[in-house]
């Protein structure tokens, strides 16, 4: 009797188990009692990345330079184009449909991880003993100056935004 379920890489239609089209090809006609599934390769600007029964291939993604995008990896008949962002920008989502400038870490914060084309700058608060007095997308928190190594004393304590101020030691009268 006609099957109710089919093997892997097959699909059920009109009581027939038909072969799916391989990645890079689209369905032209279903199999019949007397014929195989017929598939055709996707055109140059299209792709299908799975075993499928799609009658249309998907268009490759367009990396729009007006949105700050550029091609990281050209698409094939089996893979989509991968976009990334131009220098100084990163993707707004995993699918990378547009780009925004990397954020800078404000004073009191340093760069934990420099931004890439697909990820934003990661900032971290400067811990005790470190500071950042600039807004930057590259600079880490810097350690306070060690007055002792210069035979100086701390005249003004450091904060997460400022370095310590060193001064000469008081002379005994």
């Amino acid at each position: 009797e006609p099957p109710t379920a089919c093997r892997e890489k097959q699909y059920l239609i009109n009581s027939q188990c038909c072969s799916l089209c391989q990645p890079g090809q689209k369905l032209v006609s279903d199999c019949t009692e007397f014929t195989e599934t017929e598939c055709l390769p996707c055109s140059e600007s299209e792709f299908l990345d799975t075993w499928n029964r799609e009658t249309r291939c998907h268009q490759h993604k367009y990396c729009d330079p007006n949105l700050g995008l550029q091609v990281q990896q050209k698409g094939t008949s089996e893979t989509d184009t991968i976009c990334t962002c131009e220098e100084g920008l990163h993707c707004t989502s995993e699918s990378c449909e547009s780009c925004v400038p990397h954020r800078s870490c404000l004073p009191g914060f340093g760069v934990k991880q420099i931004a890439t084309g697909v990820s934003d700058t990661i900032c971290e608060p400067c811990p005790v003993g470190f500071f950042s007095n600039v807004s930057s997308a590259f600079e880490k928190c810097r350690p306070w100056t060690s007055c002792e190594t210069k035979d100086l004393v701390v005249q003004q304590a450091g904060t997460n935004k400022t370095d310590v101020v060193c001064g000469p030691q008081d002379r005994q009268r």
Epitope: S19, V28, S29, D30, T32, E33, F34, T35, E36
Partner: antibody
Framework: QVQLQESGPGLVKPSETLSLTCTVS?????????WNWIRQPPGKGLEWMGY???????NYNPSLKNRITISRDTSKNQFSLKLSSVTAADTAVYYC?????WGQGTLVTVSS | DAVMTQSPLSLPVTLGEPASISCRSS???????????LNWFQQKPGQSPRLLIY???NRFSGVPDRFSGSGSGTDFTLKISRVEAEDVGVYYC?????????FGQGTKLEIK
């Protein structure tokens, strides 16, 4: 329900061209399947002559050399057989078929 | 061409008894995808052929389950588990893996 119906002259003179039409109802000939012509000489077995596919492309039995043409009229959902330079050996019942569904057949006699 | 050879050509059977028809091909009917397009047809006197079995072993819609098909490669069999009076006719195998499609010569089943 898919139905096929052959039509055409039952008598053809030797050396002339045999022409038959198959009208299909219940299914579009452009949707899928191969649409075949098969013949059966009186008291003999079946012989596949050729087909026209849903996309309009053809395949013919090499035994019929260059005598056979299968065409279609999609507006009427029909496909047709032309067999040129016929002889008495082409006398047969001619069937159009999708293979799972067949016409009732039409007897064509080649005689002067 | 794939030459299809059926045996026996004549098969007298007692009602209620089983019957078996063999069909051998001159070349393998398994295609590159591992599918085999071997079909069985029944033709009763004065009627068009009727599809019984497709792709070696699949019964076509409405065909009684006393009919079964088996085989692979080049050797195929049609079995009738218990012959009934209405099964009288000629049985043909047809391969549609290779072009040209080719029929066996036919096996005439009759009641003893």
């Amino acid at each position: 329900q898919v139905q096929l119906q052959e039509s055409g002259p039952g008598l053809v003179k030797p050396s002339e061209t045999l022409s038959l039409t198959c009208t299909v109802s219940g299914y579009s000939i452009t949707s899928n399947y191969y649409w075949n012509w098969i013949r059966q000489p009186p008291g003999k077995g079946l012989e596949w002559m050729g087909y026209i596919r849903y996309d309009g492309s053809n395949n013919y039995n090499p035994s019929l050399k260059n005598r056979i043409t299968i065409s279609r009229d999609t507006s009427k959902n029909q496909f047709s057989l032309k067999l040129s330079s016929v002889t008495a050996a082409d006398t047969a019942v001619y069937y159009c078929a999708r293979l799972d569904y067949w016409g009732q057949g039409t007897l064509v006699t080649v005689s002067s | 061409d794939a030459v299809m050879t059926q045996s026996p050509l004549s098969l007298p059977v007692t009602l209620g008894e089983p019957a078996s028809i063999s069909c051998r091909s001159s070349q393998s009917l398994e295609n590159t995808n591992g599918n085999t397009f071997l079909n069985w047809f029944q033709q009763k006197p004065g009627q068009s052929p009727r599809l019984l079995i497709y792709r070696v072993s699949n019964r076509f819609s409405g065909v009684p389950d006393r009919f079964s098909g088996s085989g692979s490669g080049t050797d195929f069999t049609l079995k009738i588990s218990r012959v009934e009076a209405e099964d009288v006719g000629v049985y043909y195998c047809l391969q549609v893996t290779h072009v040209p499609f080719t029929f066996g010569q036919g096996t005439k089943l009759e009641i003893k």
